[in-house]
């Protein structure tokens, strides 16, 4: 009795983060006994797609010319061999961003922080909105989830990070996001560059836990440690 | 041309189970989902319940869920709805409708049948 | 549950664009619920129209038209004739169901 067929693995090019109306191609790729490919979203009502496997049939492409919010969400793939399908793909995130006009990134009280300080990256909206995200150019993953409780909408929410060291340092994003759909993110803010300057160094987080210096799992987001979110969020993280 | 045709349809008295059938031709049955959906007397469409092209997923209304059961062969090109403990309410026109082969290239629901009727009665 | 509801009857003439709404007793209707829609012709003559990703089904003429407005789905007919006139059904997907609208009967005055 052979066991169950390997999954296959799954993946985006550029990437799985992709802007209104741009281009984004789901690649699944399983053996070269596969004779049919399969895309699944997560709780759509029917199979996604389905394609014919690529010479030399150990992968599949599909295509979405361009990125609207039907296309966002999580999927998993799967392939068809002579002995049936196989266990499905790790799933794969594909958020839209633009959904939702961009927020304004700003620094309190300033950008430009000495070692050891606190400093407070505050996230405003023009329209109420449930969830804000914070993300540092060429960090692995988003930094902080701020999700407001019972769905009460927001107009801004507050990152602190207390006490700041240099690796805190960089250049910042934010996006808003309506509950309903994580998956679908307002355009990125105007970039934030966040400026450490002085010596009060303390010992150096890994440059993964970009927002914090406790300690924790390596490359994954923590909580920054400090004063409460804004009044109605709560911190959330992935 | 797409062709679904019901069968199995009668007189039941509550309680008792019923089996219909779809038969499909016209196109590639394993390739397609498809849908059970019924109208009672003088209303509106209420879903039943889908099974996807392999027979590995199926979805139910809450109000048969636990005593009705979708399935499919694929040899046969036939679909089956399993309808047990049937109650008053369930006095409808049972409709089988194909389903889509993929949702980036289909409309659910397409293709319907003629129907048939189940009356639960004492 | 979900409770999908529509206008119970609409009346245009031929020529004219109507619209038929849908609306999702749990909030907006959104792209995750598939907004799909069928038509019923006299005789229990059910076909569908419009569903999937956005997709009209082959034969369907372009007169026909799905989009959400506000927080609603909607069907368009645009230049709407008189073998238009029938009951048209939306049915949206919450999850792991669907549910189906009451159904809207669409009058053509010829």
């Known amino acids: 009795q052979a066991g169950p067929l390997p999954k296959p693995t799954l993946w985006a090019e550029p990437g799985s983060v992709i802007s209104w109306g741009n281009s984004v191609t789901i690649w699944c790729q399983g053996t070269l006994e596969a004779r049919e490919y399969r895309l699944d979203k997560e709780e759509s009502p029917a199979p996604w797609d389905r394609q014919n496997p690529l010479e030399p049939k150990n992968k599949a492409r599909f295509s979405i010319p361009s990125m609207t919010e039907d296309y966002a969400g999580r999927y998993r793939c799967y392939y068809r061999s002579p002995v049936g399908w196989s266990q499905p793909s790790d799933p794969l995130e594909l958020v839209m961003t633009g959904a939702y006009s961009k927020p304004t990134l700003s620094a309190l009280p300033s950008p430009l922080v000495t070692s050891g300080k606190s400093v407070t990256l505050l996230c405003q909206s023009r329209s109420p909105m449930d969830t804000f995200l914070l993300i540092k150019e060429r960090a692995a993953h988003p930094l902080l989830h701020l999700r407001s409780e019972h769905g009460a909408q927001q107009h801004q929410a507050e990152f602190p990070m207390s006490p700041v060291t240099s690796v805190h340092g960089g250049t910042y994003r934010c996006f808003s996001s309506h509950g309903f759909s994580h998956y679908l993110l307002s355009h990125p803010s105007d970039p934030l560059e966040l400026i450490v300057s002085g010596s009060l160094e303390g010992p150096r987080p890994s440059p993964t836990r970009s927002v914090s210096t406790a300690a924790g799992p390596e490359d994954q987001p923590l909580m920054p440690t400090g004063s409460v979110p804004h009044s109605g969020l709560r911190r959330h993280w992935e | 041309q797409v062709q679904l045709v019901e069968s199995g349809g009668g007189v039941v008295q509550p309680g008792r189970s019923l089996r219909l059938s779809c038969a499909a031709s016209?196109?590639?049955?394993?390739?397609?989902?498809i849908h059970w959906v019924r109208q009672a007397p003088g209303k509106g469409l209420e879903w039943v319940a889908v099974?996807?092209?392999?027979?590995?997923?199926?979805y139910y209304a809450d109000s048969v869920k636990g005593r009705f059961t979708i399935s499919r062969d694929n040899s046969k090109n036939t679909l089956y709805l399993q309808m047990n403990s049937l109650r008053a309410e369930d006095t409808a026109v049972y409709y089988c409708?194909?389903?889509?082969?993929?949702?980036?290239?289909?409309?659910?629901?397409?293709?319907w049948g003629q129907g048939t009727l189940v009356t639960v009665s004492s | 549950d979900a409770v999908v509801t529509q206008e119970s009857a609409l009346t245009t003439s031929p020529g004219e664009t109507v619209t038929v709404t849908c609306r999702s007793s749990?909030?907006?209707?959104?792209?995750?619920?598939?907004a799909n829609w069928v038509q019923e012709k006299p005789d229990h003559l059910f076909t569908g129209l419009i569903g999937?990703?956005?997709n009209r089904a082959p034969g369907v003429p372009a007169r026909f038209s799905g989009s959400l407005i506000g927080d609603k789905a909607a069907l368009t007919i645009t230049g709407a004739q008189t073998e238009d006139e029938a009951i048209y059904f939306c049915?949206?997907?919450?999850?792991?169901?669907?549910?189906f609208g009451g159904g809207t009967k669409l009058t053509v005055l010829g």
């Open positions: 099974i996807w092209f392999d027979g590995n997923n199926k």
């Open positions: 016209g196109f590639t049955f394993s390739n397609y989902g």
């Open positions: 749990t909030g907006a209707v959104t792209t995750s619920n598939y």
């Open positions: 999937g990703i956005n």
């Open positions: 409708a194909r389903d889509v082969i993929t949702l980036v290239r289909g409309v659910p629901f397409d293709y």
């Open positions: 049915a949206l997907w919450y999850s792991n169901h669907w549910v």
